[in-house]
């Protein structure tokens, strides 16, 4: 006889996560990013939609714009002019691509409490911003840039050649927005608003992707996007600068491209103003292993911009592509010529370097077998950055301060010991002169945002601690999560395992691999999430694993550049290797293993299913790439080179999903795609389906009409419900 189990009322009231919880966003969290307007003041949109100004020094708050005013024009966003005389109110938000959207803008005059009448802004506007000083306005309408000296003034038209899908001024075309900048804007005010720099993108020769948008009409619309696929003609970019005080005087002046860049196809990658009369441009060869940083100065006598060769700094990679996902941006110091920048050191780890004259003479500021990830702020005496150094966990982010005023420079981890269990993944937001800063912790515990003194690092107050979420989770049986590593053939494979609440190592569990695996990505991060896979572990008793294999980021160039010119090989191998190791752990039912992924993850999951290992019973690919010839030039060529005979065509052909159609015969495959995917075109899945049909291989498929790469709205609910049914059937779990 065994004694009856002691009744534990607390455990009995605990419940598992439901799919409904996930789809309703019941356990979503909030973050608090102050909208800084000075060293000690910030704005925040309150829960009831008032715009509130907070003064940290006095602790006082002020409602500067009432929700009544916001509601009068249905505003969902706002922007205060730097002179605090006006606020733009944004309404009629209409999403275009990942970052871009159009909107209607109203200008509210804070002085008299009325909307500015006369010379109203046209609609819809593609981008609008205040000058950094005063209240000049720059905006983009119908692909042309306009300037207003004051909100009530008539506009001055800067460009005239803007044309839909042909010439883009001040905004990027599709590929620059998604893969290069990546922003919705391509114009930049100088620090005091004297000059306005902007990019012009000429897409006239770019092939167009066309797809049907079904809508509700009798005839579907056709969406046309100039979209350069691998090897195709690319946009032609030019950079101009105009004097905003006297815009008609000499007009826009083009900034010269460095000769070594201009000799073949190239990209513009970013623009950084240093002073009102000094600007820094970054350029990149089409073969993306050479980047040039060019510092240009205004010539008052000629009213032109001069970019001497002595102010060109070359960054080159001999083992892969330049930079990480993007080439890093410089952060200039107060002398307005030297700067700090993250790039690979001699040991192949991305670190902060100080460049005073030449890159060759760069002084390395950080070093070690870890990586510096972002430079947040440089002040007269401090540099704030994030890295994954602490305790050697690559999936963590802590904020550090290096004193640059003293020698030798001293380093302090600002966040490492603040809330050690709860917080291991931070970002930060700094006020002017870093007088104060906000820390936003994303996990692994419940996210929390806090305000700190920039001199002492002392916590001043909690901005958001997600109390409601904490309370809501009190009676939920969340899965357990662990982050560990596997050492295989001199490769370190970090993994995150999500385990059912009552996990018992002596039992056998079905395993689901969730994969992304794209170059310079990271899936194994110490962040909080209650999502679909949390539900699968909590309610359905699955073990879920995420593995960062070769090609992933922040662990050095050896791992990162291992996939260079060879996408679709090692990423897949490493997922398979990890699965074999998981089986060896003894608690995985090797007859019930699945893999799923989205986008690049859909590509990897498809290739893993078609690897012929017999490891996977089933799998799902959502919006997968199926051939690198179908994807965007900027992204694809960075990692794969060109699809030409004399470059890398052979591997382009070898790495398609279609080439492995036969190997899907012994797995259950669910293929999913949105028909209006502007990013990974439906073409990718159409070609997989065609190859499977031609090979007479059975599979399941679901399309989402008029949905893009995000499969949002009602499609999300349908998608996750559908995938849940598929997995439960695969794993023989009762409904």
């Amino acid at each position: 006889l065994r004694p009856s189990r002691v009744h534990n009322s607390e455990e009995n009231t605990m419940r598992a996560l439901t799919l409904k919880d996930i789809l309703n966003g019941t356990f979503s969290y909030k973050t608090f990013f102050p909208n800084w307007i000075s060293g000690q003041e910030y704005l925040h949109q309150s829960a009831d939609n008032n715009i509130v100004l907070y003064n940290i020094e006095t602790g006082q708050s002020y409602t500067i714009l009432s929700n009544r005013t916001m509601k009068s024009v249905n505003a969902s966003n706002y922007g205060l002019s730097p002179d605090r005389q006006f606020v733009y109110l944004e309404s009629d938000y209409s999403k275009l691509w990942r970052y871009s959207y159009t909107a209607t803008y109203y200008i509210y005059d804070l002085s008299n409490g009325e909307f500015v009448r006369g010379n109203e802004l046209p609609r819809p506007i593609q981008y609008l911003c205040w000058s950094p000083v005063g209240s000049k306005l720059a905006y983009v309408y119908q692909n042309n840039i306009y300037l207003k000296q004051r909100p009530g003034d008539p506009p001055f038209q800067i460009t005239f050649n803007g044309r839909e899908n042909k010439i883009f001024n001040g905004i990027p075309d599709w590929v620059y927005e998604e893969e290069m900048l990546p922003t919705k804007y391509a114009l930049w005010w100088s620090p005091n608003g004297k000059f306005l720099a902007y990019a012009e993108f000429n897409d006239k020769d770019i092939p167009v992707i066309a797809y049907s948008y079904y809508g509700d009409e009798q005839y579907p619309r056709t969406i046309n996007i100039p979209y350069p696929k691998a090897g195709a003609k690319n946009p032609v970019v030019r950079i101009f600068i105009i004097d905003t005080t006297y815009p008609a005087y000499v007009g826009p002046q083009e900034v010269p491209v460095p000769a070594m860049i201009a000799s073949s196809d190239y990209y513009f990658s970013w623009l950084t103003w240093v002073t009102d009369e000094r600007v820094c441009l970054q350029w990149l060869k089409r073969v993306q292993n050479v980047s040039v940083l060019s510092i240009c100065d205004f010539r008052e006598d000629w009213q032109t911009w001069d970019c001497p060769k002595t102010q060109e700094h070359i960054e080159e990679s001999r083992t892969g592509w330049a930079g990480g996902f993007f080439v890093s941006r410089p952060v200039f110091s107060y002398d307005a010529i030297s700067y700090y920048k993250i790039f690979s050191d001699k040991d192949g780890y991305k670190h902060i370097h100080y460049i005073k004259d030449t890159v060759e003479n760069a002084i390395q500021i950080t070093s070690g077998k870890w990586e510096a990830i972002n430079i947040f702020r440089v002040t007269q005496d401090s540099l704030f950055y994030s890295s994954n150094e602490f305790e050697e966990y690559p999936g963590r982010r802590n904020i550090y301060r290096i004193s640059i005023g003293s020698y030798p420079p001293s380093k302090k981890c600002v966040t490492c010991h603040l809330r050690k269990e709860r917080c291991q993944y931070y970002t930060a937001s700094f006020s002017d002169y870093a007088k104060y800063y906000a820390l936003v912790c994303y996990g692994p515990g419940i996210p929390i945002s806090t305000l700190h003194d920039g001199r002492t690092d002392q916590e001043i107050k909690i901005l958001e601690e997600n109390k409601e979420l904490e309370n809501a989770l009190k009676n939920i049986q969340l899965p357990k999560e662990e982050i560990k590593k596997l050492e295989v053939d001199e490769i370190t494979l970090w993994y995150k395992m999500i385990l059912p609440p009552q996990f018992d190592r002596s039992k056998k569990y079905p395993l689901l691999i969730q994969v992304y695996g794209g170059p310079c990505s990271q899936s194994v991060r110490s962040v909080f999430a209650v999502n679909w896979i949390s539900y699968l572990a909590s309610k359905e008793g699955m073990v879920i694993a995420l593995v960062d294999g070769r090609g992933t980021a922040f662990q050095g160039d050896k791992l990162l550049y291992a996939v260079y010119r060879k996408l679709g090989v090692y990423e897949v191998e490493d997922q398979i290797t990890a699965v074999r190791k998981f089986i060896e752990m003894g608690f995985i039912d090797e007859k019930r293993i699945a893999i799923w992924g989205w986008s690049y993850g859909g590509y990897v999951s498809s290739l893993a299913l078609a690897s012929g290992t017999g490891l996977f019973k089933c799998g799902i690919a959502v919006a997968p790439v199926s051939s690198w010839e179908y994807y965007a030039s900027v992204y694809t060529e960075r990692f794969m080179g060109l699809p030409t005979k004399d470059d890398n065509l052979e591997h382009y052909k070898n790495s398609t999903v279609m080439a492995r159609a036969e190997y899907f015969r012994n797995v259950d495959y669910l293929l999913i795609h949105g028909t209006a995917d502007d990013n990974v075109h439906f073409q990718n899945s159409a070609q997989i389906a065609k190859a499977l049909v031609n090979a007479q291989v059975d599979f399941q498929a679901m399309w989402y009409s008029d949905q893009n790469h995000g499969l949002s709205g009602l499609s999300t609910n349908h998608l996750y419900t559908h995938m849940t049914h598929f997995l439960k059937q695969c794993f023989s779990l009762s409904d």
Partner: nanobody, 123 residues
Framework: QVQLQESGGGLVEAEGSLRLSCAAS????????MGWFRQAAGKERELVAA???????LYADNVKGRFTISRDNARNTVYLLSNSLKPEDTAVYYC?????????????????WGQGTQVTVSS
């Protein structure tokens, strides 16, 4: 250049009222934003209320509904009417002026100041 002189301070009981006045010199008073700040012992000087040249007002959230700022451009005067006063309203009250926007809450952003008037609220 503008000169400012406050008046109207004094001792008042809790829940009482007070009207502070600030007289400004100069012909261009109407083009200035005007503000009332206060400084309690050992504390930072804080903006209580401000009024723009165009007449729109800004209040600290903890005085909203109790304090009213107004201006009379003909008399070159700005007023602060304080009702339902609390002991924590005890401070030296300063009148301040600046060109441009009234929506600045740091005292360093206001170049012109009066000498201040003491307000004491007894419980």
């Amino acid at each position: 250049q503008v000169q400012l002189q406050e008046s109207g301070g004094g001792l008042v009981e809790a829940e009482g009222s007070l009207r502070l006045s600030c007289a400004a010199s100069g012909r261009t008073f109407g083009s200035y934003a005007m503000g009332w700040f206060r400084q309690a012992a050992g504390k930072e000087r804080e903006l209580v209320a401000a009024i723009s040249a165009g007449g729109s007002t800004l209040y600290a959230d903890n005085v909203k509904g109790r304090f009213t700022i107004s201006r009379d451009n003909a008399r070159n005067t700005v007023y602060l009417l304080s009702n339902s006063l609390k002991p924590e309203d005890t401070a030296v009250y300063y009148c301040a002026a600046r060109r441009g926007s009234a929506y600045y809450t740091n005292h360093i952003d206001w170049p012109y100041w009066g000498q201040g008037t003491q307000v004491t609220v007894s419980s």
